[in-house]
């Protein structure tokens, strides 16, 4: 029967006895750097290359002995898993192996670079199809490793890597924390993070998505014919790498940006049970496990946004945060986030000829997160819309004026320490959907963006009742590209984007003890793309 | 049910060329590795090489390298063993038989297809 | 290449009376990544084909009377027949599967006393 792995990234149209998807990932290179590998086992012969490449540091210990079976083990079971004829993910993916792990599983930060810029060197010497660089490996936060990451990513290469399997904030460790790698973290058959040993699979704001990561069986180095099952991010990484070389094989033009955005957009949402995250990971971290696309065709119509989540900003009084998207996505709307509640807002601001999400703290606060809802828009014209405090008392309002341009998000910011408790509730005049509203002494920021067919609508849940959460969430065939609360008298922690639901959190009602608090207001903007749409067909 | 069935006796001249043929049904054959073993007569088993039928992949006993070829019609669900110069000594039984990543033992077998070569 | 050695050649047993074959690898087919001796046995009655009778050396494959049982690990196995019966009377062959190419003992001809 199916491994259960395997069952779990497919979607259920594709489900039979065996895992036979529509496209092996044959026109992909998969890179692998990780340990040497037993080439000639049955479920990889033919399918992997071993390059010449090895940089790897000597073993510890004076009695070490070096068994080949050993030394093979852990790379074997990921060229495996990526493109195994039997329990790969890819069957018809080629892979090439670079050694930059001993037989003991460590490396050197050098010996990854210089497997990197072979990488880079084989590429520009003979360039092939879509390449996917798999980085089964995590180290301690290395600028330099992730540098060298986002050029190969500029590049062009698709690089996936382990989150790591220490139990901790995957941005700590490195490649994990490079922006322009997938990082991936491990769940295992009930979708629950892995658990290894005392320590299990690394999460957070830097996780992309997780992927079937433990008690994944593969080949082993130990004889031809072996299998062995192996658990940790490595193998959720490996999956990912093979789903990648899958979608890149259906769509070899795919960008980076796009095949995260795929990658996301069709992976199981909200199926892991947060509660195994520390308390304060839980909203950072994404539930999200990866599969394959219901069809490798025809997702281009469709409008592709993610949620990204900036580095807190610390607790001094002007820190700000900082999100940023992808060079080749549109930052559509930005929304704030502190847990204590004292925040003074965000905004979007240009900073090298790129929109980016600043956040900012407050007096006495623990800090802020800025939340960037980053989206693929070809052909986007956006800019921002900024009205000055108003001190009026209809509160501050600002919209897209110019022709042609939609509403895709509204942000506010304030000077004033501590805003909201005590102010009026400002009511927006309805029938203006393209205009954002906010307190009187607060500057609002509307994203206002123009591309073919844009179009987009205002979505809001207001509850009377003080609650700790609100949310409102777009339909079908509409995408969430804007996030916030509308200004009332609850004392709201923030908003952020779940996929396609809008997220407004208030402080917890039995803390602040008071039930006269006035509404929470969740507003979602959801847009969707007729000209993406059209184009779709035309391509059927 | 699950079976292979193996084409019919032949009896070829030295020199001749041949192609014996098992179809396998009743599973799915391009996710299992079918394996050729010859049986001299009175004598034991011999593993000539195996193919798997998904990527058309073989591994040849060493043995029988250059002295057969097998291939694999996934569309047909059918796995042959080839000769181009057939010898007396290729007189035997031969058996194809099918096995899995998670079961690499030959758990089904064909009913054997009888190859004599005699001038 | 692994050289499976069986013995004895032949045997011969009186019916409802024990069988014993033994065999043995030229290099160990247990393996510590996942604990299992790659070792099977198989019958052939005369003009059939082999039939699958144990595997990972001690599993018996469904529809097996439970009178076959294998034994033993990394180099030397044992096939027992607790009880002979008629229908037993057959060829007998060890194979192992873990490394190329795969081998099988000369086999070893069992029949009634």
């Known amino acids: 029967s199916i491994p259960w792995n395997l069952e779990r990234i497919t979607p259920p149209r594709y489900r039979a006895d065996e895992y036979q998807p529509p496209d092996g990932g044959s026109l992909v290179e998969v890179y692998l750097l990780d340990t040497s590998i037993q080439s000639d086992h049955r479920e990889i012969e033919g399918r992997v290359m071993v390059t010449d490449f090895e940089n790897v540091p000597e073993e510890d210990g004076t009695r070490f002995h070096r068994q080949a079976s050993k030394c093979d083990s852990h790379g074997t079971h990921l060229a495996g898993v990526v493109s195994g004829r039997d329990a790969g993910v890819a069957k018809g993916a080629s892979m090439r192996s670079l050694r930059v792990l001993n037989c003991q599983g460590k490396g050197t930060v050098s010996g990854t670079l210089i497997g990197l810029e072979f990488i880079r060197k084989s590429q520009l010497v003979q360039p092939v199809g879509p390449l996917v660089v798999l980085l089964p490996l995590a180290g301690g936060y290395s600028r330099v490793l992730n540098a060298a990451c986002q050029r190969l990513a500029r590049a062009g290469v698709v690089l996936v890597t382990a989150a790591g399997n220490f139990r901790d904030d995957a941005c700590l460790y490195s490649p994990a924390s490079a922006p322009e790698v997938i990082t991936v973290g491990a769940t295992n058959a009930q979708d629950q993070p892995v658990t290894l040993g005392t320590l299990g699979t690394n999460f957070g704001r830097c996780v992309d998505l997780f992927a079937p990561g433990e008690d994944i069986i593969g080949a082993s180095s130990d004889c031809s014919t072996c299998f062995v099952s192996q658990s940790g991010t490595s193998q959720a990484a490996a999956h990912v790498a093979g789903i990648a070389a899958m979608m890149l094989s259906a769509e070899p033009e795919l960008t980076l940006a796009e095949l995260r955005q795929r990658l996301i957009h069709f992976s199981a949402k909200d199926v892991i049970n947060e509660a195994w995250f520390p308390e304060d990971q839980r909203v950072l971290t994404p539930n999200l496990v990866a599969a394959l696309p219901p069809s490798t065709h025809g997702a281009g119509w469709q409008l592709f946004c993610r949620t990204v989540w900036s580095a807190h900003s610390g607790p001094t009084r002007m820190a700000t945060a900082v999100a940023r998207c992808a060079p080749d996505e549109e930052l559509l709307s930005c929304s704030s986030f502190s847990r204590s509640g004292k925040r003074r807002g965000e905004r979007m601001e240009a900073q090298g000829g790129k929109l980016v999400c600043r956040a900012h703290n407050a007096f006495g606060g623990e800090g802020v997160y800025a939340i960037a809802r980053c989206c693929l828009l070809p052909q986007a014209n956006c800019s921002v819309h900024t009205a000055p405090p108003a001190e009026a008392s209809m509160g501050t309002r600002v919209h897209c004026h110019q022709q042609g341009h939609v509403l895709t998000g509204c942000s506010s910011h304030w000077e004033v320490e501590d805003l909201g408790t005590h102010k009026p509730p400002v009511l927006r005049p309805r029938g203006q959907p393209n205009q954002c509203v906010g307190h009187r002494e607060a500057s609002i920021h509307a994203s206002c963006c123009h591309a073919p067919g844009l179009e987009c609508k205002v979505k809001e849940h207001g509850i009377p009742a003080p609650q700790e959460q609100v949310t409102v969430a777009c339909e079908e065939g509409w995408t969430l590209t804007g996030c916030s609360a509308l200004p009332g008298t609850s004392h709201v922690l923030g908003a952020y984007a779940v996929d396609n639901t809008c997220v407004v959190r208030s402080r917890d009602v039995s803390t602040t003890g008071s039930t006269s608090e006035g509404a929470v207001t969740a507003v979602a903007i959801c847009c969707r793309s007729r000209h993406l749409a059209q184009a779709s067909q035309e391509l059927q | 049910q699950v079976q292979l069935v193996q084409s019919g006796a032949e009896v070829k001249k030295p020199g001749e060329s041949l192609k014996i043929s098992c179809k396998g049904s009743?599973?799915?054959?391009?996710?299992?590795?079918i394996s050729w073993v010859r049986q001299m007569p009175g004598k034991g088993l011999e593993w000539m090489g195996l193919i798997y039928p998904g990527d058309s992949y073989t591994r040849y006993n060493p043995s029988f390298q250059g002295q057969v070829t097998i291939s694999a019609d996934k569309s047909i669900s059918t796995a042959y063993l080839q000769w181009s110069s057939l010898k007396a000594s290729d007189t035997a039984m031969y058996y194809c038989?099918?096995?899995?990543?998670?079961?690499?033992?030959?758990?089904?077998w064909g009913q054997g297809t009888l190859v004599t070569v005699s001038s | 290449d692994i050289v499976m050695t069986q013995s004895p050649d032949s045997l011969a047993v009186s019916l409802g009376e024990r069988a014993t074959i033994n065999c043995r690898s030229s290099?160990?087919?247990?393996?510590?990544?996942?604990?299992?001796?790659?070792l099977a046995w198989y019958q052939q009655k005369p003009g059939q084909p082999p039939k699958l009778l144990i595997y990972w050396a001690s599993t018996r494959e469904s529809g097996v009377p439970d009178r076959f049982s294998g034994s033993g690990s990394g180099t030397d196995f044992t096939l027992t027949i607790s009880s002979l019966q008629a229908e037993d009377v057959a060829v007998y062959y060890c194979?192992?599967?873990?490394?190329?190419?795969?081998?099988f003992g000369q086999g070893t001809k069992v029949e009634i006393k």
């Open positions: 290099q160990s087919v247990l393996y510590s990544s996942n604990n299992k001796n790659y």
């Open positions: 038989a099918r096995d899995y990543y998670s079961r690499p033992f030959s758990d089904i």
């Open positions: 194979q192992q599967y873990s490394s190329f190419p795969i081998t």
């Open positions: 009743g599973y799915s054959f391009t996710n299992y590795y």
